[in-house]
């Protein structure tokens, strides 16, 4: 049974040419996080895998940076970056949890960069920002 919930930074805005951090946090479940996908509409931006660490899609390598934590940093923003972003948590045994963030990239300097919450850095093991492996092998 899926008991977890995903908190996200919600609706956010940023200035053209600037950068923004997209963050999600999965709570209320003991499920093992095996992978987190970041997607923009149906385009894959990045993956953070428990075994492999981060993989950034080649077409976004210049403008996407992993972290902090399981979050994603978008750089050199353009107006075309406006839209929906999804964090997709693959977990065992619960299954897939999805969080939604809407980003608006503004021409002017009235963008607010504040996020609703800070992800606690202690939530994730390992220095290389891999998802928590939980108890390891499951059988």
């Amino acid at each position: 049974m899926m008991t977890g919930t995903i908190e996200t930074t919600g609706n956010i805005s940023a200035e053209k040419g600037g950068s923004i951090i997209l963050q999600c946090h999965l709570s209320s479940t003991t499920a093992q996080v095996t992978q987190v996908n970041w997607e923009q509409q149906d385009q894959l931006l990045a993956i953070c895998n428990a075994d492999l660490g981060w993989h950034i899609s080649p077409s976004f390598k210049d403008r996407v940076a992993p972290g902090p934590g399981l979050g994603l940093t978008l750089q050199s923003l353009t107006v075309n970056d406006t839209g929906e972003y999804f964090c997709i948590y693959h977990t065992y045994p619960d299954g897939t949890y999805t969080g939604r963030i809407f980003l608006e990239v503004l021409e002017s300097s009235v963008a607010e960069h504040g996020a609703r919450f800070q992800i606690p850095t202690g939530d994730y093991k390992d220095d290389d920002d891999k998802p928590n492996k939980g108890s390891g092998t499951t059988s």
Epitope: T34, I47, H90, P93, T98, K133, T137, S139
Partner: antibody, heavy 119, light 107 residues
Framework: EVQLVESGGGLVQPGGSLRLSCAAS????????MHWVRQAPGKGLEWVAF????????YYADTVKGRFTISRDNAKNSLYLQMNSLRAEDTAVYYC????????????WGQGTMVTVSS | DIQMTQSPSSLSASVGDRVTITCRAS??????LAWYQQKPGKAPKLLIY???TLQSGVPSRFSGSGSGTDFTLTISSLQPEDFATYYC?????????FGGGTKVEIK
């Protein structure tokens, strides 16, 4: 070109054991999770087991849990399925399949190896 | 476990026909459904994943739609090489489960 080649199938008596192998080539094996899926004669597909790229996550179908063991050797680009306490209902073609990088869908499959459990 | 129910179990169609196969999950699987094609004596081939994303190299006459519990595979204009058995698979949660298959035969 991605290639997956299974071997090790054959005829075995009930209660016996077999070890299946899957040799991978044409891609960076150590980056991908791998599945075993089986298909009984004239029947549909049944997922059997999964192992993540670095072996930290291993899952089994309830029908094989405690009897089958999935493992991999990334240095040898090989996937294995150790099958013990075999039953007649384990008779099937066994396929190894690669998991997509992003989802648990299976994007490349081997040609399969037949396992027959009969006395 | 999530049960996947495909319909119909078989159908007869002609080259050029529009063919629709449905798959229903026993509970919501969001968009996480894959479709496979299997020909006799051959391994399955991935056509579509995440409900509607076409696997690289798959002809555009194949399309997928749906979310939640109800999904559809459509072949817009059936070709001779499309006569095969089609399976759906949920990749939302463990254990990953398949539908029973739909055999597409020549009318």
């Amino acid at each position: 070109e991605v290639q997956l080649v299974e071997s090790g199938g054959g005829l075995v008596q009930p209660g016996g054991s077999l070890r299946l192998s899957c040799a991978a080539s044409g891609f960076t094996f150590s980056n991908f999770g791998m599945h075993w899926v089986r298909q009984a004669p004239g029947k549909g597909l049944e997922w059997v087991a999964f192992i993540s790229s670095g072996s930290s996550s291993i899952y089994y179908a309830d029908t094989v849990k405690g009897r089958f063991t999935i493992s991999r050797d990334n240095a040898k680009n090989s996937l294995y399925l150790q099958m013990n306490s075999l039953r007649a209902e384990d008779t099937a073609v066994y396929y190894c399949a690669r998991m997509r990088l992003d989802y648990y869908a299976m994007d490349y499959w081997g040609q399969g190896t037949m396992v027959t459990v009969s006395s | 476990d999530i049960q996947m129910t495909q319909s119909p179990s078989s159908l007869s169609a002609s080259v050029g026909d529009r063919v629709t196969i449905t798959c229903r999950a026993s509970k919501s699987i969001s968009k996480y459904l894959a479709w496979y094609q299997q020909k006799p004596g051959k391994a399955p081939k991935l056509l579509i994943y995440s409900g509607s994303t076409l696997q690289s190299g798959v002809p555009s006459r194949f399309s997928g739609s749906g979310s939640g519990t109800d999904f559809t595979l459509t072949i817009s204009s059936l070709q001779p090489e499309d006569f095969a058995t089609y399976y759906c698979q949920q990749h939302n949660e463990y254990p990953w489960t398949f539908g029973g298959g739909t055999k597409v035969e020549i009318k």
